[in-house]
Interface confidence: medium
């Protein structure tokens, strides 16, 4: 006779690991016991149970209710053992002793390997600003056995640096993602894969990138100054910049406080109907928590009479 | 059928030495936990040493420690017990019983040798 | 080393009587424990095993219970045959260990 077993059972942590073990005798061969043993290099053999064709199933303490025979129908060649709920410091050598009568002993070695799969970490890196250099935007880890495969999904353009930690029975590793910050990356999703032979399919984490920046200020309005007159109404000034985080606005005159009337909302700067003290130099201030930035412009209040008064003048000098 | 059967029991004096054997038919010796168990006159029953298929592991009382040495034969089918410096409260008829391992009751028992301790 | 502690050491009874003997362990050995019948002269012989499984060839009025650390070996009705010494022997772990023993004689 002979004992078929493989040589590796892979199992994935928390699953129950089938250890096979099958006499294939000749006719009227008996097994008297099975014996299962860890047999890992440098150690004592330590017992894990022993099927007894008298006695059953024995299991020896140090494995008391981790041990079970397959479910029935049971052959009584049949010398497989289920090790429940696999722990990393169950992966190693085992071996099964089968004692058959008349023909003597048989032993078969196999090897456990308990898949360990991660459970990736991702950690955004210091806040990312316009006008930096190559900066870390985010770095993954995750650790499990073996080492899993950490990369990177997106559209944004960087470069990818990973490192490795070797533990006694796993390996950590880390993924660092660096680019250059632009505005142009902003809300854009920066994705850790994680691929492992334990995982059913790869795990996924997303980052939103957020870069901080501020645009140049101007401001709108004056585009045709015929229209700043006295008497005008709805007469406004918008003040135009964008930022992440988003910016707030002031206004201030810069050669005396703003006329009365005149109404601030946001970026926008109201007037009521126009008169000569509304000319004056404004200024839009724009910041956020990055940077601040100021858009000046000058109003002149044209006066109607004056200006046809002139006309007059410059016609008649003609 | 199973059988076991001791031998190298006898008088011997305190500090003297004797060697058991026990030897085994019937079943597949080198795959069994094989003990050695001791019982004084009119006393009860105590656990003197042990031994794995493979001798990889090995256990003694506490009283024989040191002085007894377990061994075994597969080729021969034969359990040993090297006794030194025997001492009067080693006096006992000493049985050896298998089992399939350390864990598993003792379920197959020679009929015992009997080791007189005295001057 | 896990100490067997059995009681009573010793009882008298009668033909048709239900006897209990019980034993304790110094410590939790689960349901690792044995027990054995010896008749004078004679070579101990396996009743029970992993506390309550009964050898094959062993009459149904011997059954045992208990886990942990306290155990009991119980005869439904003594026979004749039944007088002798029983021990309880823990196999949880090395060094193996006996009970002192309890004599069961007749009334």
């Known amino acids: 006779g002979e004992l078929e077993t493989s040589d590796v059972v892979t199992v994935v942590l928390g699953q129950d690991a089938k250890l096979p073990c099958f006499y294939r005798g000749d006719s009227g061969e008996q097994v008297g016991q099975v014996a299962w043993a860890r047999v890992d290099a440098g150690e004592g053999a330590q017992e894990l149970a022993l099927l007894h064709s008298k006695y059953g199933l024995h299991v020896s303490p140090a494995y008391e209710g981790r041990v079970e025979q397959p479910p029935p129908p049971r052959n009584p060649l049949d010398g497989s053992v289920l090790l429940r709920n696999a722990v990393q410091a169950d992966e190693g050598e085992y071996e099964c002793r089968v004692s058959t009568f008349p023909a003597g002993s048989f032993q078969a070695r196999l090897r456990l390997r308990v898949l360990v799969p991660p459970l990736p970490s991702l950690n955004p890196g210091p806040a990312l600003e316009e006008g930096q250099g190559l900066t870390l935007a985010a770095s993954c880890t995750a650790e499990g056995s073996p080492a899993p495969s950490v990369t990177w999904d997106t559209e944004v353009k960087g470069t990818t640096s990973s490192r490795s930690f070797k533990h006694s029975r796993s390996a950590a590793v880390t993924s660092e993602f660096h680019l250059v910050p632009s505005r142009s990356m902003n809300g854009q999703p920066l994705t850790c894969v994680v691929s492992h032979p334990g995982l059913l399919q790869d795990q996924r984490i997303t980052h939103i990138l957020h870069v901080s920046f501020l645009a140049e200020a101007s401001v709108r309005g004056l585009e045709d100054q015929n229209l700043w007159h006295i008497g005008r109404e709805g007469a406004m000034l918008k003040c135009l910049s964008e930022g992440q985080p988003p910016p707030s606005y002031n206004w201030t005159r810069l050669d005396g406080p703003l006329p009365s009337g005149v109404r601030v909302d946001g970026d926008t700067l109201g007037f009521p109907p126009l008169t000569t003290e509304h000319s004056g130099i404004y200024v839009c201030h724009v910041s956020n928590e990055f940077s601040s930035r100021d858009s000046q412009v000058t109003v002149d209040v044209l006066d109607p009479q004056e200006d046809s008064g002139k006309q007059v003048d410059l016609v008649s000098a003609s | 059928e199973v059988q076991l059967v001791e031998s190298g029991g006898g008088l011997v004096q305190p500090g003297g030495s004797l060697r058991l054997s026990c030897a085994a038919s019937g079943f597949t010796f080198s795959d069994y936990y094989m003990s050695w168990i001791r019982q004084a006159p009119g006393k009860g029953l105590e656990w003197v040493s042990g031994?794995?298929?493979?001798?990889?592991?090995?256990g003694y009382a506490d009283s024989v420690k040191g002085r007894f040495t377990i061994s075994r034969d597969n080729s021969k089918n034969t359990l040993y017990l090297q006794m030194n410096s025997l001492r009067a409260e080693d006096t006992a008829v000493y049985y050896c019983?298998?089992?399939?391992?350390?864990?598993?009751?003792?379920?197959?028992w020679g009929q015992g040798t009997l080791v007189t301790v005295s001057s | 080393d896990i100490q067997m502690t059995q009681s009573p050491s010793s009882l008298s009874a009668s033909v048709g009587d239900r006897v209990t003997i019980t034993c304790q362990a110094s410590?939790?050995?689960?349901?690792?424990l044995n027990w054995y019948q010896q008749k004078p002269g004679k070579v101990p012989k396996l009743l029970i095993y992993?506390?309550?499984t009964l050898q094959s060839g062993v009459p149904s009025r011997f059954s045992g219970s208990g886990s942990g650390t306290d155990f009991t070996l119980t005869i439904s009705s003594l026979q004749p045959e039944d007088f002798a010494t029983y021990y309880c022997q823990q196999s949880y772990s090395t060094p193996l260990t006996f009970g002192g023993g309890t004599k069961v004689e007749i009334k």
């Open positions: 992993a506390a309550s």
């Open positions: 019983a298998s089992s399939g391992s350390w864990y598993l009751p003792l379920d197959y």
């Open positions: 031994i794995s298929w493979n001798s990889g592991s090995i």
């Open positions: 410590q939790d050995i689960s349901n690792y």
